[in-house]
Interface confidence: low
Amino acid sequence: QETELSVSAELVPTSSWNISSELNKDSYLTLDEPMNNITTSLGQTAELHCKVSGNPPPTIRWFKNDAPVVQEPRRLSFRSTIYGSRLRIRNLDTTDTGYFQCVATNGKEVVSSTGVLF
């Protein structure tokens, strides 16, 4: 079972959306909250939350030190949420530290937020 969180947390994917002309009438993209910086310990689990709202619902990508984040089975994963996206890194190692950026786009606009894991 995944650990449940007290912050925005466990609601998930928003991938293949049907974007109708109706949806496009009132398009917007908002960063609901800047990403937090996180300090944690080796071996622990870290979570970064990208909180965005948009119409049409945004596509969200994650970058670490400007390179796309690659998921690792059972260790590093990200899930889209109805609030945006959540990046989870388990069993932290020193190599996991760095600048993490989420980039959200609704096809018209782009917003991003950066947090530091150290």
Partner: antibody
Framework: QVQLVQSGAEVKKPGASVKVSCKAS????????MHWVRQAPGQGLEWMGW????????KFNHKFDGRVTMTRDTSISTAYMELSRLRSDDTAVYYC???????WGQGTLVTVSS | DIQMTQSPSAMSASVGDRVTITCQAS??????LIWFQQKPGKVPKRLIY???SLANGVPSRFSGSGSGTEFTLTISSLQPEDFATYYC?????????FGPGTKVDIK
Amino acid sequence: QVQLVQSGAEVKKPGASVKVSCKASGYTLTTNYMHWVRQAPGQGLEWMGWIYPGNGNTKFNHKFDGRVTMTRDTSISTAYMELSRLRSDDTAVYYCARSDFDYWGQGTLVTVSS
Amino acid sequence: DIQMTQSPSAMSASVGDRVTITCQASQDIGNNLIWFQQKPGKVPKRLIYFATSLANGVPSRFSGSGSGTEFTLTISSLQPEDFATYYCLQYREYPLTFGPGTKVDIK
């Protein structure tokens, strides 16, 4: 422990407005979304929308567009849902629920009757 | 809007029975599904999230399966306190939509 405590039952006339409050304790209101869900007597559940108390952003079910307002007062850790132009079919129990629907308020019965 | 349907709408069962409730979405919702239990006059209680993850404090006799458009809530051995109405909720798309509910009562 996490608690959501809602305001008491209301009786309103058609065309009036009602404002329901939801006071949060045991966690940080501003970093968790707050959903509002309603349930008419003997019926199922209906999602109305959410507010992000951190900045006041809202997302509504289009069914309620123009009639629902969601606000918050972070100084007293309270979220509010106001529904205007009430009709008899708005008679329901109104619930607030935290981000992931893991904690719910006890519900507020709103009766709309002439 | 995504339509959620549940079957059966009501069922009678006995203590110890294995109970299966299904929820169908009108389009693919991945695993964006929550199951709730609600007893008369009470607040809904979250049982399962991510379609298959058991919420904290929920007995292991409850389990969820499925993805895409077909989902199942299973109670492996029905207990007296399980007689209630069960709802599914999709959170793939706005507006979030609930199923109409399945009432489980005593046979």
